[in-house]
């Protein structure tokens, strides 16, 4: 028969033959022959490979690396690798999170958006009219004006992005 | 580990019949074809026949062939090679070797066969 | 098929020295689908290359194979007083039948 130009799904064509590749966990160790089929070995503790393959070395585990501020989300397995994220109050500066930073925190005249994640910053935006926020914070958002009104007293100075308004006791000379 | 161990050897008469065994262990057998290749005294290696993992497919040297047949048990882990209408000239010992693109890696011990009256 | 000559079919050397084992063969070895064997007496054949130049595992490094095509060369840089033996080439690609060389013994001088 007329050697093969292309083979199936799950296999690789070498020196005019079609040989299975290797599952997900297992690495290469011989090609197959007309006689034997692929050879292939499970990959090592802290190893993986996570694709049908035919490659003869399995890939290193990633290490969340403590000094960079990483710890493990999830173990790697023989199929997948190690999920890394950041300690409590750091994100990833990256999609392939090797390497934290500290969250940033809102300075005042601005709050907090969105809470900072192991993988995603602190979302500031600015306080609108009538909101306020005086401290820098990670995780405070924009506080709305006191209402005097409500306590029975008038506004004795205007509030602005970063200050509360000053409420006062009613002038009682005023009829 | 990888071992192959033969056996079924010994004297026999020309015209006679023998049936040796190879018995594998340490991998899986079921996944790897299987040769048998043998050595005359004093002589070089001699390629004899190679059997298919399944045991689908069967080829033979021609100084073999129609006399001797090739074949496996995969539930016993066991090459076999029936020897019949046994000359002279088979007199050798028998190694069984496993089949991988990297050539024949591993060998049995070997076992003797004479043929003699 | 394919017939494979060895030359020398002798080779006398002393330990330390370098040895070179030719293996030519008939016509073109396919995919160089070539290897050589190490048989000491009383025992069986052991893998040394495969593919012509890759060593087999835990095959010393003073082990080296070359060529391709029609012509291959096994060199021992030093021989070791372990490796005199008898070696054999083998051709794994074009079957029925899978050939070997006649064999070169290295020999202590």
């Known amino acids: 028969p007329e050697p093969p130009t292309a083979c199936r799904e799950k296999q690789y064509l070498i020196n005019s033959q079609c040989c299975s590749l290797c599952q997900p966990g297992q690495k290469l160790v011989s090609d197959c022959t007309e006689f034997t089929e692929t050879e292939c070995l499970p990959c090592g503790e802290s190893e993986f490979l996570d694709t049908w393959n035919r490659e003869t070395h399995c890939h290193q585990h990633k290490y969340c690396d403590p000094n960079l501020g990483l710890r493990v989300q999830q173990k790697g397995t023989s199929e997948t690798d190690t999920i890394c994220t950041c300690e409590e109050g750091w994100h990833c500066t990256s999609e392939a999170c090797e390497s934290c930073v500290l969250h940033r925190s809102c300075s005042p005249g601005f709050g907090v958006k969105q809470i900072a994640t192991g993988v995603s910053d602190t979302i500031c935006e600015p306080c609108p009219v009538g909101f306020f926020s005086n401290v820098s914070s990670a995780f405070e958002k924009c506080h709305p004006w006191t209402s005097c009104e409500t306590k029975d007293l008038v506004v004795q100075q205007a509030g602005t992005n970063k200050t509360d308004v000053v409420c006062g006791p009613q002038d009682r000379l005023r009829a | 580990q990888v071992q192959l161990v033969e056996s079924g050897g010994g004297v026999v008469q020309p015209g006679r019949s023998l049936r040796l065994s190879c018995a594998a262990s340490g991998f899986t057998f079921e996944k790897y074809g299987m040769h048998w290749v043998r050595q005359a005294p004093g002589k070089g290696l001699e390629w004899v026949a190679v059997?298919?993992?399944?045991?689908?497919?069967?080829y033979y040297a021609d100084s073999v062939k129609g006399r001797f047949t090739i074949s496996r048990d995969n539930s016993k882990n066991t090459l076999y090679l029936q020897m019949n209408s046994l000359r002279a000239e088979d007199t050798a010992v028998y190694y069984c070797?496993?089949?991988?693109?990297?050539?024949?890696?591993?060998w049995g011990q070997g076992t003797m066969v004479t043929v003699s009256s | 098929e394919i017939v494979l000559t060895q030359s020398p079919g002798t080779l006398s050397l002393s330990p330390g020295e370098r040895a070179t084992l030719s293996c030519r063969a008939s016509q073109s070895v396919s995919y160089d689908y070539l290897a050589w064997y190490q048989q000491k007496p009383g025992q069986a054949p052991r893998l040394l290359i495969y593919?012509?130049?890759t060593r087999a595992n835990g095959i010393p490094d003073r082990f080296s194979g070359s060529g391709s095509g029609t012509d291959f060369t096994l060199t021992i840089s030093r021989l070791e007083p372990e490796d005199f033996a008898v070696y054999y080439c083998?051709?794994?690609?074009?079957?029925?039948?899978?050939?070997f060389g006649g064999g070169t013994k290295v020999e202590i001088k």
């Open positions: 593919g012509a130049s």
């Open positions: 059997i298919h993992y399944e045991g689908s497919i069967k």
């Open positions: 070797a496993r089949d991988t693109s990297r050539g024949h890696d591993i």
């Open positions: 083998g051709e794994y690609a074009d079957y029925p039948p899978f050939t």
